[in-house]
């Protein structure tokens, strides 16, 4: 997701088909306030960014509103009137869905079903990860809708759960970003808990000389 040009490193993120964030690391332009100009239609005039991201008092990015029908971003980053980087991109390639909202759990014997409100657009995977104190790594299960059932759980064990949303590669390509994880929720015997014991790490084998 990083484009390079004239000492400029660019990163694009398209948050939930709502907001585009373009950030830059302008190593060749220290102490310069680069300006960001953009449009969503080739025939329009460029608009200048109105919401800049600042780093150490200097511009390092722009946040701009997008609509779901906006799919190509034309942009130019300028030092004064001099363009230092100009590009046009399909912004769907840089999608980052929002985190799962209204997450709820329902327990039934040795299984738990996590549900949340589906996002309003297609091509997403809803991933649930879970682990007990006996697991050194998270286990994972994912579905096309936010209705994910994890089976074969031991009701006596304490399980930590977290969820996120990912863009399907078939729908958006391989260079998207997963959403942030939801808050970790802990459950034991069908009831919520503040926390589970930390996973046990296997003892390191002693090396014989």
């Amino acid at each position: 997701q990083v484009a390079t040009g004239e000492g400029l490193q660019i990163q694009i993120m398209y948050f939930n088909l709502e907001t585009v964030q373009v950030t830059w690391n302008a190593s060749h332009y220290p102490r310069s306030n680069l300006s960001f100009h953009y449009k969503f239609s080739r025939d329009e005039a460029y608009d200048q960014c109105t919401v800049y991201i600042l780093q150490e008092g200097h511009t390092s990015g722009c946040l701009l509103d997008a609509e779901q029908q906006d799919d190509i971003l034309y942009f130019s980053i300028r030092n004064g009137t001099h363009p230092v980087f100009t590009a046009s991109r399909w912004i769907f390639y840089y999608l980052k869905p929002s985190s799962p909202k209204q997450v709820s759990f329902s327990w039934h014997q040795d299984a738990v079903t996590l549900t949340c409100s589906d996002l309003s657009y297609r091509g997403l995977l809803y991933e649930v990860q879970y682990r007990s104190p006996f697991d050194t790594e998270w286990q994972s299960k994912q579905e096309n809708t936010c209705n994910v059932t994890v089976e074969d759980l031991d009701a006596e064990k304490c399980y930590a759960f977290r969820a996120r949303v990912k863009a399907m590669e078939d729908a958006y390509g391989p260079d998207t970003y997963p959403s942030d994880w939801s808050e970790v929720t802990c459950w034991q015997r069908g009831e919520t808990r503040d926390s589970c014991p930390e996973p046990r790490t296997p003892p390191k084998p002693k090396l014989s000389k």
């Epitope: 769907f92 590669e169 729908a171 958006y172 390509g173 391989p174």
Partner: antibody, heavy 122, light 107 residues
Framework: QIQLQESGPGLVKPSQSLSLTCSVT??????????WTWIRQFPGKKLEWMGY???????YYNPSLKSRISITRDTSKNQFLLHLNSVTTEDTATYYC??????????????WGQGTLVTVSS | DVVLTQTPATLSAIPGERVTMTCKAS??????LHWYQHRPNETPRLLIK???RSITGIPSRFSGSGSGTDFTLGINNLEAEDFAIYYC?????????FGSGTKLEIN
């Protein structure tokens, strides 16, 4: 098994319009998510993407062709059409129609026609 | 536009050899780079999508790698039918663009 077939005149006079048709069999051009494209190959073998029309009729054109290009479709015949105005000898090329791979918002082109050579000459 | 530079322009080899060719993008394009084979008098054929993902029906001797700006197509154990022109194409930049091609010819 999808097949694409281009058809149209092989010779066009400068300043006239070029119209080509791509007939698609074995697959509906209205299938959700798929985009239909025109690509041309110049005599020196360079390939140029010209434009797309989507399953939803949305079109995208190469800015280099400015306002000369139009892509339309005829769903009753399962065809999509290329119109290129004010042609010059620089438009002499082999014209291909192709299908864009589903997803990734118009990525790679997984099915192509055989191509039709169009010569612009007086 | 994102410019794709393919090298070498011509590659000479003999059947049974392994060859590699490269495609360099003027701007970073992640892994959204695709490879095509175009034999004379045939329709272009998609070989590799997204830098390294295989395509159903394409022999396993074709492989791709790379990300960002530098990409490679490799062909193991060359067969007579592999002698053709190979093109790379990027998709995140608008408009989509193709490289100028690498012609693989029999030595």
């Amino acid at each position: 098994q999808i097949q694409l077939q281009e058809s149209g005149p092989g010779l066009v006079k400068p300043s006239q319009s070029l119209s080509l048709t791509c007939s698609v069999t074995g697959f509906s051009i209205t299938t959700s998510g798929y985009y239909w494209t025109w690509i041309r190959q110049f005599p020196g073998k360079k390939l140029e993407w010209m434009g797309y029309i989507g399953y939803n009729s949305k079109t995208y054109y190469n800015p280099s062709l400015k306002s000369r290009i139009s892509i339309t479709r005829d769903t009753s015949k399962n065809q999509f059409l290329l119109h290129l105005n004010s042609v010059t000898t620089e438009d002499t090329a082999t014209y291909y129609c192709a299908r864009s791979l589903y997803g990734g918002y118009k990525d790679a082109f997984d099915s192509w026609g055989q191509g039709t050579l169009v010569t612009v000459s007086s | 536009d994102v410019v794709l530079t393919q090298t070498p322009a011509t590659l000479s080899a003999i059947p049974g050899e392994r060859v590699t060719m490269t495609c360099k993008a003027s701007q970073s394009i992640g892994t959204s780079l695709h490879w095509y084979q175009h034999r004379p008098n045939e329709t272009p054929r998609l070989l590799i999508k997204f830098a390294s993902r295989s395509i159903t029906g394409i022999p396993s001797r074709f492989s791709g790698s790379g990300s960002g700006t530098d990409f490679t197509l490799g062909i193991n154990n060359l067969e007579a039918e592999d002698f053709a022109i190979y093109y790379c194409q990027q998709s995140p930049g608008f408009p989509p663009t193709f490289g100028s091609g690498t012609k693989l010819e029999i030595n």
